[in-house]
């Protein structure tokens, strides 16, 4: 799967949306690697 910074940002946005934003405070694009997905 795509591991560029932009792909990571969009995947994280989708994850946050599905979880209702209930994730760790530091779960942001610049803190998570592609392995987080």
């Amino acid at each position: 799967s795509c591991n560029t910074a932009t792909c990571v940002t969009h995947r994280l946005a989708g994850l946050l949306s599905r979880s209702g934003g209930v994730v760790k405070d530091n779960f942001v694009p610049t803190n998570v690697g592609s392995e987080a997905f």
Epitope: C2, T6, C7
Partner: antibody
Framework: EVQLQQSGPELVKPGASVKISCKAS????????MNWVKQSHGKSLEWIGD????????HYNQKFKGKATLTVDKSSSTAYMELRSLTSEDSAVYYC????????????WGQGTTLTVSS | DIVMTQSQKFMSTSVGDRVSVTCKAS??????VAWYRQKPGQSPKALIY???YRYSGVPDRFTGSGSGTDFTLTISNVQSEDLADYIC?????????FGGGTKLEIK
């Protein structure tokens, strides 16, 4: 309100260097990557690279390696792009851009900085 | 590098019409394509990400479709303010690359 405010137009001589700034406001600067894009007159867009403001990590377009250096100052929420050994080919509008998720999910661009390289 | 080809440099349409702007990638980029609108003298403005998702505030007249190598931005009920360049971008691979743009002209 999310904003990316870029520094003003630059007129520089061939061979010189220039440092363009992009000050972010309205969101947590260190949470999102900052991209830099070149638009030569009448042409489309070229991606220069991105920087992770959290740790300073960068990805560069091979074409701009040795030409552009991307840095950040976390304390002022400002991203910088330095361009060196300037030639007329570097005359263009340069944009910073960042995709944020919070407070709003959007792809924001700065207003652009016009660089003119001329003797 | 991935080449993004927008074969139509100019397109002419009338207010109220429907127009489709196409973009072709030189390799499979999955759904990882964005579309931008750039009005004369302005910064690009994001319209679509992940090939088919509209950013907040983008009118539903703008619809993106496609995956792999072939992508389309469709503008329904064209308005006079849609006079602009429409540019695709792939972000599946580094370096990100942009299409050459399609200039939409209003008759």
């Amino acid at each position: 309100e999310v904003q990316l405010q870029q520094s003003g137009p630059e007129l520089v001589k061939p061979g010189a260097s220039v440092k363009i700034s992009c000050k972010a406001s309205g969101y947590t600067f260190t949470d999102y990557y900052m991209n830099w894009v070149k638009q030569s007159h009448g042409k489309s867009l070229e991606w220069i690279g991105d920087v992770n403001p959290n740790n300073g990590g960068t990805h560069y377009n091979q074409k701009f390696k040795g030409k552009a250096t991307l840095t950040v100052d976390k304390s002022s929420s400002t991203a910088y792009m330095e361009l060196r050994s300037l030639t007329s080919e570097d005359s263009a509008v340069y944009y910073c851009a960042s995709i944020t998720i919070v407070p709003v999910y959007f792809d924001f661009w700065g207003q652009g900085t016009t660089l003119t390289v001329s003797s | 590098d991935i080449v993004m080809t927008q074969s139509q440099k100019f397109m002419s349409t009338s207010v109220g019409d429907r127009v489709s702007v196409t973009c072709k990638a030189s390799q499979n980029v999955g759904p990882n394509v964005a579309w931008y609108r750039q009005k004369p003298g302005q910064s690009p403005k994001a319209l679509i990400y992940s090939a088919s998702y509209r950013y907040s505030g983008v009118p539903d007249r703008f619809t993106g479709s496609g995956s792999g190598t072939d992508f389309t931005l469709t503008i329904s009920n064209v308005q006079s303010e849609d006079l602009a360049d429409y540019i695709c971008q792939q972000y599946n691979y580094y370096p990100y690359t942009f299409g050459g743009g399609t200039k939409l002209e209003i008759k």
